[in-house]
């Protein structure tokens, strides 16, 4: 029998550094977790112990946060070179930039292979990014090989911005080919790498014959064995085994997200390549896990440009940014509207005399609003100022919604007002009105909306029967804070831009900003 | 292999009914919007109605807003077509499709099944 | 409603030749455009989403371009498998729409 032992991230997005608890930015450095400096301690630590080792990434170490925007993915090819990563799938997320932004900043830089089988190149493109990714690398590992096959979300059109000249293809379909010529080399124990989530990762492990181990991400899925670690629900199982068409039986794994844990896998193979055994779970890069020196100081180095970024000024505001949980939470809040309305100037595009605009409207948790700003620091506002507001490196996305999933959307960010719960909604074209003297689910007795195919916007009621184009937080069109019905009834959703990259545009743009409370959001007399 | 196989298709009688149903696999069916389009013989192909993910949310065609009722069953992996007071202008081949993630145009396509509105 | 406008109606081209077929929305609809091939007798197949990406396993001869109202579809070399009749759809906005089509047959 053969023993190779897999580390594996996924979903990192751009957290070089340690992080609080819940990956934002770490305040406590005594409680923080994750980031490179700590991971390479680990897989040092595990290099050194084990004999046959890999060192696996399945996707999205792009975006996220100011060393994303800054370093646009050279930080990724860098400090996963420094790591000595010996392989990783592409990610959705890797598209972010265009194929420009994924080609010289990454797949020119890194010195280990990035894979995706399902990804073909077309046009002038294939020329150009021929040989810099690759459908699968055959690995030496020891005395073995080891072949791994990638893959990428069929939907990365949707969610990135891969362009024209790259195909998108069927994961199952693309991966079959690839593993049978691998087999045709020689290759016996084959590990499919991807990111397409944890149920196309079980559809793999079910359908692609000759795939031993599936390797995911994508879903951000938390799978262990035992008592948890930390705050992570596990979906199942680490490994989860899924018994494949031909009566084997696959482990799949994923390890959460933003390098909080490393996955660690057990593998053993008997001689044929056939899995024997499979035993692990995800290691909580806790502090008790003690920074890399070497890493940690590279990372300081890095991080001097991030600093000098991070304090320039984008504007000024001559008012206060109200975005305290007292506020944003409980009533409409300048900092909301703020927000809102730089969601709407992102999204402007008149192009059409009938329409000023294709879309007026905004809806965003209070919940999302972490901080407010002072104007008594000169009125400057800088990126780090934004970041305390906006932490979590969401997106503001474009859905449409029928009239009446607005209403219940509406209805729900009151349905236990008053407890300082984040669904309270903040909005922009919208003006509602709320009477709390209502039972729940039937509080909302007034809710207007701005025109769009109009040449002088104005509010008219909501009909429940149309379908309205509306900007939020991807956390919203997932159904993040109970908004449960805005996932289950959308009927189109587009990716949008970076939160923090919007508003601090618009800021740029507006060079001074005073945004007041000005009656979007109103209670009836009686109630409140 | 994505597939979409409909059923349910027939000859009624002008206002009679019929319901249309369309199994799918190969793919998360509780992931995607689903929807149905027609083409009437020798015409071009006609949006009729959409229905988001979860079922909560429909969207109609003004020709058959009131008399077609789209549903689904993710327990089953099947959409449905519930077509009342039929007239000969709804007589047409019903295709069943599957949208892209998010909405964005139909990728997939059942085979359609024939609807005759005749007395 | 969003008019979509096909033309022309219908083409005859030899084998290899270059074709172009174009659609016009009554209003922008950015790119959210989709072509669709339908042989008699049988259900459409998805050529191109987004106006211009081309869907899975079909071949690189087809290619979309355009954005807002002005849209084209193009096959570099007709083949004698490409006769068939073609439909331009936008979702940008419900209720989603079809253009005439156009049939493409060989000469």
């Known amino acids: 029998a053969w023993e190779l032992t897999i580390l594996h991230t996924n979903d990192v997005h751009s957290r070089l550094e340690q992080t609080s608890e819940d990956s934002s930015k770490c305040v406590n450095a005594s409680r923080c977790m994750g980031g490179v400096a700590r991971l390479f301690t680990k897989v040092q630590q595990i290099r050194r112990a084990e004999p046959n080792v890999l060192l696996l990434d399945a996707g999205d170490q792009y975006q996220g946060t100011i060393w994303f925007t800054v370093y646009k993915g050279a930080e990724v090819a860098h400090f996963m070179n420094a790591l000595r990563y010996d392989a990783m799938a592409l990610g959705n997320h890797e598209f972010d930039n265009g194929v420009e932004g994924l080609i010289e900043p990454l797949l020119k830089e890194a010195k280990f292979p990035i894979l995706s089988a399902n990804i073909k190149a077309k046009g002038p493109l294939a020329s150009q990014i021929s040989g810099l990714y690759l459908p699968y690398k055959v690995l030496p590992v020891g005395d073995e090989v080891v072949g791994i096959v990638g893959y990428t979300s069929k939907e990365t059109p949707f969610l990135s911005n891969p362009g024209t000249n790259l195909v998108f293809e069927d994961e199952i379909t693309a991966l079959q080919p690839e593993v049978d010529k691998l087999k045709t080399l020689n290759v016996n124990k084959i590990i499919a790498l991807g990111h397409s989530g944890f149920e196309m990762d079980k559809l793999i492990a079910q359908k692609v014959r000759g795939v031993d181990v599936v390797v995911g991400g994508h879903s951000n899925t938390f799978l262990y064995t035992g008592n948890p670690p930390s705050k992570e629900v596990p979906a199942g199982k680490y490994p989860f085994i899924v018994t494949s068409d031909d009566g084997r039986k696959v482990p799949v794994v994923q390890a959460y997200a933003f390098g909080k844990y490393l996955g660690y896998l057990k593998i053993e193979f008997d001689e044929r390549g056939n899995v024997i055994s499979s035993h692990g779970n995800p290691i909580l890069l806790n502090s008790s896990i003690p920074e890399d020196p070497s890493i940690k100081a590279d990372i300081n180095k890095w991080r001097i440009k991030l600093d000098n970024y991070s304090t320039q000024e984008l504007g000024k505001t001559i008012v206060y940014l109200d975005g305290s949980s007292q506020s944003c939470r409980f009533r409409e809040c300048n900092m909301g509207n703020l927000i809102c309305d730089a969601m709407i100037n992102n999204n402007l595009r008149h192009t059409d005399e009938m329409f000023w605009n294709h879309v007026s409207m905004c809806i965003l948790n209070g919940g999302g609003i972490r901080s407010p700003i002072d104007e008594r620091n000169n009125g400057t506002i800088t990126w780090e100022n934004l970041a305390a507001v906006l932490p979590f490196g969401g997106t503001f996305d474009l859905v449409q919604l029928k009239g009446s999933t607005l209403k219940k959307a509406f209805e729900h960010s009151v349905h236990r007002y008053g407890q300082s719960t984040g669904e309270f909604l903040q909005v922009g074209g919208i003006h509602v009105v709320y009477d709390l003297s209502r039972k729940p689910g039937d509080r909302v007795v007034k809710l207007d909306v701005l025109c769009t195919k109009c040449r002088v916007p104005s509010y008219d009621p909501l009909k429940m029967d149309e379908v309205y184009k509306v900007i939020l937080p991807n956390f919203l069109a997932n159904g993040g804070d109970g908004f449960q019905m805005i996932k289950d009834e959308l009927l189109r959703h587009d990716s949008g831009d970076q939160d923090i990259n919007v508003v601090s545009t618009y800021i740029s743009k507006m060079k001074v900003i005073y945004p007041a409370v000005e009656g979007r959001i109103k209670f009836s007399t009686g109630s409140h | 292999e994505v597939q979409l196989l409909e059923s349910g298709g027939g000859l009624v009688q002008p206002g009679g009914s019929l319901r249309l149903s369309c199994a799918a696999s190969?793919?998360?069916?509780?992931?995607?919007?689903m929807g149905w389009v027609r083409q009437a013989p020798g015409k071009g192909l006609e949006w009729v109605s959409s229905?988001?993910?979860?079922?909560?949310?429909?969207i109609y065609a003004d020709s058959v807003k009131g008399r077609f009722t789209i549903s689904r069953d993710n327990s089953k992996n099947t959409l449905y077509l519930q077509m009342n007071s039929l007239r000969a202008e709804d007589m047409a081949v019903y295709y069943c499709?599957?949208?892209?993630?998010?909405?964005?145009?139909?990728?997939?396509w059942g085979q359609g099944t024939t609807v005759t509105v005749s007395s | 409603d969003i008019q979509m406008t096909q033309s022309p109606s219908s083409l005859s081209a030899s084998v290899g030749d270059r074709v172009t077929i174009t659609c016009r929305a009554s209003?922008?609809?950015?790119?959210?455009l989709a072509w669709f091939q339908q042989k008699p007798g049988k259900a459409p197949k998805s050529l191109i989403f987004?106006?211009?990406s081309l869907e899975s396993g079909v071949p690189s001869k087809f290619s979309g371009s355009g954005s807002g109202t002005d849209f084209t579809l193009t096959i570099s070399s007709l083949q004698p498998e490409d006769s068939a009749t073609y439909y331009c759809?936008?979702?940008?906005?419900?209720?989603?729409?079809f253009g005439g089509g156009t049939k493409v047959e060989i000469k």
């Open positions: 499709a599957k949208d892209h993630l998010g909405g964005h145009g139909m990728d997939v």
């Open positions: 190969g793919f998360t069916f509780s992931n995607y919007i």
């Open positions: 229905i988001s993910s979860s079922g909560g949310a429909t």
């Open positions: 209003q922008d609809i950015s790119n959210y």
């Open positions: 987004a106006a211009s």
């Open positions: 759809q936008q979702y940008n906005s419900y209720p989603l729409t």
